[in-house]
Interface confidence: low
Amino acid sequence: KRFRDVLGHEQYPDHMREHNQLRGWSSDENEWDEHLYPVWRRGDGRWKDSWEGGRVQAVLTSDSPALVGSNITFVVNLVFPRCQKEDANGNIVYEKNCRNDLGLTSDLHVYNWTAGADDGDWEDGTSRSQHLRFPDRRPFPRPHGWKKWSFVYVFHTLGQYFQKLGRCSARVSINTVNLTAGPQVMEVTVFRRYGRAYIPISKVKDVYVITDQIPVFVTMSQKNDRNLSDEIFLRDLPIVFDVLIHDPSHFLNDSAISYKWNFGDNTGLFVSNNHTLNHTYVLNGTFNLNLTVQTAVPGPCPPPSPSTPPPPSTPPSPPPSPLPTLSTPSPSLMPTGYKSMELSDISNENCRINRYGYFRATITIVEGILEVSIMQIADVPMPTPQPANSLMDFTVTCKGATPMEACTIISDPTCQIAQNRVCSPVAVDGLCLLSVRRAFNGSGTYCVNFTLGDDASLALTSTLISIPGKDPDSPLRAVN
């Protein structure tokens, strides 16, 4: 049997393999050692018994999408059945005082791979260590502590495989410099020691994406905006645009990045070298925001040719973005069409190629409450004998839209611990002036928060107020 027969997934076309060579990986045309690593078909009853106490789940994650030329990292974590864990020696043990289907477990081994009787298995240079090999019969590497590594991980993608010894987690990075843009599948099979052989305990696969566009995500935030996720913002207040470039391998660290903004409001093109930018819309309406990110990255040098025209000065236009049937969390980018980037061996010349990333959003600008302030605080005269509570009248003003609701939160002097919260609908005059009466339970210093809200906005102001004791000569003090 060959690796491709064992590891499954649809066969990878030969003409694609030559463009997608992964350094340090081997062709899945290689022979698989079926004696050392028995192959079980789907539905084979032995899968059920391949792990004591249940099934092991392999969870595969990656930091996809990856820009062509950057590194992409895959991490596999093994999730053991309930109450099982890996100890410091790589053995699998039951957690103390953990209840599973068998009742309470004591601290007994599930698999004690590194203890006593097995030690002979690990000796070098004898026929006894012939089984310390990967499925392609290559011997295991033997760095310090390698005996604690009880699992063999076989990663398989693009018609190639990579073998790795590990504990309950394994990590592999690949460089994408020669890879074709588009979605690919990584599949991982995990084996455990079983006497002098290795049996499969889990298989997992995941999609990853190689892209020739810079993966770009933009966060938009604005003071007083009530809902940051609805892409509705307020007129006459700056919106902070922050560009996040998904570059977990820091491929772009040494590249100068330029950001070209068109806010769709006829204010023209803004070019910046900074990933954050403020912009204020002065009209209500719906606007199409467009961002183009550009950078030059190390790339292949074009073959010398007298007839080669100069590269175009304008970037390629972004592809129309189809609505994904399931939108992916975090910054994501579907490929632009699966173009093959045929990168020959990069010569010593320092050539660079331009890469672009695009972000588009439709944002709605509405009127909102821009500002709220406390104009006046007055003590409400009380009849004698005076009750324990003090009443205060606050005169509050706002700018912008008319609020529909006012909330008052009375807290401790640090403004951290709320003691009382009251919200009520408000009727304000055209000048946005309202009077709010609140009771204070005894003397002392209080933090008073006022928030005025409507559908789109929420504006806040705070003040510290000192309520005097009942001595008629002690004055009311407000500390803004």
Partner: antibody, heavy 120, light 107 residues
Amino acid sequence: QLQLQQSGTEVVKPGASVKIPCKASGYAFSSYWMNWVKQRPGKGLEWIGQIYPGDGDTNDNGKFEGKATLTVDKSSNTAYIQLSSLTSEDSAVYFCARSPLHLRGSMDYWGQGTSVTVSS
Amino acid sequence: SIVMTQTPKFLLVSAGDRVTITCKASQSVSNDVAWFQQKPGQSPELLIYSASNRYTGVPDRFTASGYGTDFTFTISAVQAEDLAVYFCQQNYYSPFTFGGGTRLEIK
């Protein structure tokens, strides 16, 4: 447009078997997991298992071992669930639902369900 | 298998009310939780995936959050058409399991 078409109702005798189809259209059938979910009348949802048409890989709920077999026919873009040795406990609505490879449990499109009644 | 304990089982609310449903996993499921809505006589529909991501076309009154073992699902202002049963589901660990469901009824 995207559709998962299931047969309407199946009435079968105790001890018999039934094979329920789910015909997919409007998307790349081989690139999504196909899940099967059981719902007894007035009850919750129970995940039976999933199959990846690209290579026939399956991921099963051990509770249904020996009861449910998942298969696909890529030429007709159809997934099947075969239920065997039927009893009254198997009377339920069976839904097929697809999920993307990278979010294999997030079932974003569902068939309308096939009602199976086991009755003598 | 992982048990998803969903509360409450039943909610009777008025249009415009805010509703919160919680789901507790018997062990950590990272953020691999989905929320489904099933209207009477219909198939379930995906509302939320990966704990907090709203699926395409789902109104923004539906939100969710959580990580590990504790998850919440909120409808900020219930509308008449939200009458349905709501299910949480973990898809971190096979077999994938659903909560028992919350039946939402409108006064």
